[in-house]
Amino acid sequence: MMTGTIETTGNISAKKGGSVILQCHLSSTMAQVTQVNWEQHDHSLLAIRNAELGWHIYPAFKDRVAPGPGLGLTLQSLTMNDTGEYFCTYHTYPDGTYRGRIFLEVLESSVAEHSARFQIP
């Protein structure tokens, strides 16, 4: 039985050219996290954080994605094309997979607010 819950940064907005932290947090489970996958809206993998092997950033994102903090991901040099859904997938033993969703809106406006509050999707 899967007892855990994924909390995410929810819906966030950030300035074009700026950076943003994508964060998921798994709680309420004894399960052991063995891998975390980060995917973009088109299901392309951005990065993988493997318990044994550490971080792997996919080549297409190497220049703009930094691992962390923690199991999160930092997107840098944001463009308008970065607007969309992002997913964290936690592979856990013995529970299975937990998936969290974050929606990022990249704004042209120089006064774009960067809101990042934790919420359960």
């Epitope: 052991q32 063995t34 891998q35 318990a51 044994e52 033993y93 013995p94």
Partner: antibody
Framework: EVQLVQSGSDLKKPGASVRVSCKAS????????MNWVRQAPGHGLEWMGW????????TYVQGFTGRFVFSLDTSVNTAYLQISSLKAEDTAVYFC???????????????WGQGTMVTVSS | DIQLTQSPTFLSASVGDRVTITCRAS??????LAWYQQNPGKAPKLLIY???TLQSGVPSRFSGSGSGTEFTLTISSLQPEDFVTYYC?????????FGQGTKVEIK
């Protein structure tokens, strides 16, 4: 070489306690969950539960609560199984086994200890 | 809890035979199934994981198939060292369970 080496066979009297050790080498101990499996003489494999090697939190299967304790010493890459108030029916081979695979669809017990025979007899 | 039923419990065969062992789950477990081989007095050895992926170093005469609730382990040509016991195990959440085992004996 990735391996799990368990402590030797033990003969105990009913009511006594026993501790079985399982020393890991060749990999990052805290990256893989550790399981305990019992096999009574002439019987099949029985999953007793597992321990989260990151947090030290144990999870016990029904039937293995109370007298059974899983623990870790990460400084020496070792998992332990302690059984107290031993009964004749605890006579069995006890195996530790690592959960290999990193994604949910690839989990399996890929590395096993050689087994520790615990005999409970008066 | 998800129960696994292996069949047959005992299997008599000859060297060179093709044999199939079946494992049925009491509910859908996707492909979260492993197969192990156990020699008497030894620890089990992983043969197949994710229902059909051969573990590194395992001879290619072993193969696995199936998904959902019905799974099979096939040995294409039995060798003398294959006359031992085989177990399936599901890893679909908690608790993980093993099948009761299939002992392959020489006919």
């Amino acid at each position: 070489e990735v391996q799990l080496v368990q402590s030797g066979s033990d003969l105990k009297k009913p009511g006594a306690s026993v501790r079985v050790s399982c020393k890991a080498s060749g990999y990052t101990f805290t990256s893989y969950p550790m399981n305990w499996v019992r096999q009574a003489p002439g019987h099949g494999l029985e999953w007793m539960g597992w321990i989260n090697t990151n947090t030290g939190n144990p999870t016990y299967v029904q039937g293995f609560t109370g007298r059974f304790v899983f623990s870790l010493d990460t400084s020496v890459n070792t998992a332990y199984l302690q059984i107290s108030s031993l009964k004749a029916e605890d006579t069995a081979v006890y195996f530790c086994a690592r959960t290999g695979g990193h994604t949910y669809d690839s989990y399996a017990f890929d590395v096993w200890g050689q087994g520790t025979m615990v005999t409970v007899s008066s | 809890d998800i129960q696994l039923t292996q069949s047959p419990t005992f299997l008599s065969a000859s060297v060179g035979d093709r044999v199939t062992i079946t494992c049925r789950a009491s509910q859908v477990i996707s492909s979260s199934l492993a197969w192990y081989q156990q020699n008497p007095g030894k620890a089990p050895k992983l043969l197949i994981y994710a229902a059909s992926t051969l573990q590194s170093g395992v001879p290619s005469r072993f193969s696995g198939s199936g998904s959902g609730t019905e799974f099979t382990l096939t040995i294409s040509s039995l060798q003398p060292e294959d006359f031992v016991t085989y177990y399936c195990q599901h890893l679909h959440g908690y608790p993980s369970n093993f099948g009761q085992g299939t002992k392959v004996e020489i006919k």
